[in-house]
């Protein structure tokens, strides 16, 4: 045993750039820090056999898998992978370890399986072993957290039934409105499933596991905050769980708080108040109103009432299967080139929608924003002005949601030119959709200022580009042009844009730009 | 360089819960099959081993112990947490986490690296 | 739950003494047995995995042998770094037990 080498196995995950096959050897790119792998002498094997701890992986993951060898002297190696022998090519680290990698990028089913590499050293021969699956990741879940009441306590219990089993936190905060951000230093974050503190202001419990993170509000009617203009709307499924919590702030206990649903008591049971102190010995009240179980008649105005304050009322309405209620009418958008401007869709959803906003194939964050009427916004500014389609789609597990935005940039246009044997041709992309005339360049036009007025075919918005129209027109040559300069011009209301080309031969041709605004 | 650090407060009041987090570096549980998992050791007496949690969330408890114990991880922070409530001074013990790795050829080598473990006393 | 019982519960030896000590399963673990050796105020140390591979690093004077429900170390030629307490642990199934150690003490 003293006389085998010591071995390491490490796997370093990539977050990815590119896409290609498996490489064996060192490749530039943003790794996370190297994970040992256990690698240890494998019981009861003919020869010597290393094996590392089974590597799981995501689908489309990139990794490397590394073998650090203390051994004297120079190593040889050869991976193999399916029957098939693999390049490998060992380097030496600083500390003078035989180093001997294998990348794997854009995992696929193909690349899932055992992976050996064969070392030969001065000393001895050993086998390693990796063994690389794909993990499941389709049975992974992560549900929004729903509240129960505890059992004999005043408190809460947050409950996200996900899998892999996720990370529960409360997230408090007792200012208002904006400085209740995520981030903001008035935020209180536990990482327990079980609140006490109910009486903050803002309350929300988060779950979070390989998938995400999820949160749910704690729906409160405060009835010291002047009303909402519109009604606040509390939307659930048929068999979800019901809270509401109302919450008051008076100089001294002579006050109470009920909850009625559409002018009728709650029933005992459905109901539970707290009570305390705050510093400046002001008496707070919040009382719940909680149905473990919704159903459809569980529908209607839900009023907290105050012997102290004016009531308050929250319309709570039970459907049978989530929505997203939007208008999905594709939209137009012409804008300036530095002009500032965003995308926008409006939207009434339950549950919440998980969104994306899609240009040119690649997907940016999506964020949203409730509003005070119950509707909720997403917002999309980062087009960088590049004209196209734009992209806004959003799920909830019940419903699915798409909505198509063009935006075109105003500019005058850019010609590009290309001519064949038989004809030439031009090309813009200027917007709006440019105009095209051909000139001739002869000794009684130097100027190029005679027109060309056969053989010319416009076709407007031939390619569309991610929605990005090109407008191009062509010249048809005859055989006593051969030999003449042409002129194309592309003209919008922003400005003329013009190209000069040698009708000669075929191939791609030095130009001549001439810009006329 | 792979290590194992258990942190947690060294002196307990009989019926409270006991939270112990076991931090790790130089290995995940993301990527690679492994578990972690808890021992404990009272002064002067031998090792007895409370839970494990595998790198896919299954977790296993000690029979006597089952009712008490929680397990769970949070992989992005490279932490397992273990929670004994309802403790007593015979739960007085120093507290261990170690690694296991899972090989693909069905065996497993038990426990590779350990933590220095952290002394937890349960007095009034 | 498997029972795991390890003798002797205490040892006296000498520097040089070939020393055994055996550990025995309630029913068939395989070979699914480790060793381990503690000192005190420190965290065990693996010296033997599946019943009879010897740790990486781990002097070859320990030796692990056994398969089924009967299992020993055997350190050939102790040193006097080698007194310490000794535990098998069976990883067959859950729950994982300890056998009760050995003390292995200076003569």
């Known amino acids: 045993n003293q006389d085998l080498p010591v071995i390491k196995c490490v796997l370093i995950n990539h977050k990815n750039n590119d896409s290609s096959v498996g490489k064996s050897s060192s490749y530039p790119m943003v790794s996370e820090s190297p994970e040992d792998l256990g690698c240890a002498l494998r019981p009861q094997s003919a020869g010597t056999v290393y094996e590392a701890a089974t590597v799981e992986v995501d689908v489309s993951a990139s990794i490397t898998l590394q073998v650090l060898v203390d051994t004297p002297g120079n190593i040889s190696c050869l991976w193999v992978f399916k029957h098939s022998s693999l390049n490998c090519q060992p380097h030496f680290d600083v500390q003078n370890r035989g180093v001997v990698s294998m990348v794997i990028l854009k995992m696929t089913e193909t690349q899932a399986g055992e992976y050996l590499l064969f070392i030969q050293s001065e000393a001895t021969n050993y086998t390693i072993l990796f063994t690389v699956s794909i993990r499941n990741t389709l049975l992974f879940t992560l549900r929004r957290p729903y509240f129960r009441k505890m059992e004999n306590q005043d408190a809460l219990v947050c409950i996200s039934e996900s899998v892999p089993e996720p990370i529960v936190e409360w997230v408090l905060c007792d200012s208002q409105g904006e400085s209740c951000k995520e981030e903001s230093p008035a935020v209180v974050k536990k990482e327990e499933k079980v609140l006490h503190e109910l009486f903050g202001t803002d309350i929300r419990c988060c779950a979070r596991n390989e998938l995400g993170r999820e949160c749910t509000r704690l729906f409160t009617i405060d009835l010291n905050q002047t009303p909402q203009t519109t009604l606040p709307q509390l939307f659930l499924k048929v068999g979800e769980p019901l809270w509401i919590r109302c919450k008051a702030v008076h100089v001294n206990h002579g006050f109470g708080l009920t909850w009625e649903l559409e002018n009728k008591a709650l029933e005992e049971g459905s109901y539970f108040e707290m009570s305390t102190y705050s510093t400046n010995r002001t008496m707070i009240r919040i009382l719940f109103a909680f149905v473990s179980s919704v159903a459809r008649n569980d529908t209607g105005y839900y009023t907290c009432s105050s012997s102290k304050h004016p009531s308050q009322s929250a319309l709570v309405t039970i459907v049978e299967k989530g929505f997203i209620n939007a208008t999905n009418s594709s939209e137009d958008y012409e804008i300036d080139q530095y002009e500032e401007f965003c995308f926008s869709v409006r939207f009434k959803a339950y549950p919440q929608i998980r969104c994306t906003w899609t240009f040119s194939r690649k997907s940016f964050p999506c964020e949203q924003k409730g509003l005070d009427d119950g509707y909720s916004v997403s917002k999309f500014c980062n087009h960088k002005h590049q004209p196209g389609e734009y992209i806004f789609h959003a799920e909830n597990g019940d419903a699915q949601f798409t909505k198509m935005f063009t935006l075109n940039i105003r500019r005058k246009p850019q010609v590009l030119a290309e001519a064949s044997a038989s004809q030439a041709s031009c090309s813009s992309d200027g917007y709006p959709l440019p105009s095209w005339t051909w000139k001739k360049c002869s000794d009684k036009s130097p100027n190029c200022t005679e027109d060309i007025p056969e053989g010319v075919w416009n076709r407007k918005a031939n390619r569309k580009v991610f929605g990005q129209w090109v407008s191009s027109s062509t010249l048809n040559m005859s055989e006593a042009m051969k030999g003449f300069l042409v002129k194309c011009c592309a003209y919008n209301s922003l400005g003329t844009s013009c190209e000069t080309i040698l009708l000669n031969s075929p191939g791609p041709f030095p130009f001549i730009q001439d810009s006329i605004s | 360089q792979v290590t194992l650090k258990e942190s947690g407060p060294t002196l307990v009041k009989p019926t409270e819960t006991l939270t112990l987090t076991c931090t790790f570096s130089g290995f995940s549980l993301r990527y690679a099959r492994m578990g972690v998992s808890w021992i404990r050791q009272p002064p002067g007496k031998a090792l007895e081993w409370l839970a494990h949690i595998f790198s896919n969330d299954e977790k296993s408890y000690s029979t006597s112990l089952k009712s008490r114990l929680t397990i769970s991880k949070d992989t992005s922070k490279s932490q397992v947490v273990l929670t004994l409530t309802n403790m007593d001074p015979v739960d007085t013990a120093t507290y261990f986490c170690?690694?296991?790795?899972?090989?693909?050829?069905?065996?497993?080598?038990?426990?590779?690296?350990w933590g220095q473990g952290t002394m937890v006393t349960v007095s009034s | 739950d498997i029972q795991m019982t390890q003798s002797p519960s205490s040892l006296s030896a000498s520097v040089g003494d070939r020393v055994t000590i055996t550990c025995r399963a309630s029913?068939?673990?395989?070979?699914?047995l480790a060793w381990y050796q503690q000192k005190p105020g420190k965290a065990p140390k693996r010296l033997i995995y599946?019943?009879?591979s010897l740790q990486s690093g781990v002097p070859s004077r320990f030796s692990g042998s056994g398969s089924g429900t009967e299992f020993t170390l055997t350190i050939s030629s102790l040193q006097p770094e080698d007194f310490a307490t000794y535990y098998c642990?069976?990883?067959?199934?859950?729950?994982?037990?300890f056998g009760g150690g050995t003390k292995l003490e200076i003569k």
């Open positions: 170690a690694r296991m790795p899972e090989y693909s050829s069905g065996w497993s080598g038990a426990f590779d690296i």
């Open positions: 599946a019943a009879s």
């Open positions: 642990l069976q990883h067959n199934s859950y729950p994982l037990t």
């Open positions: 029913q068939d673990i395989r070979n699914d």
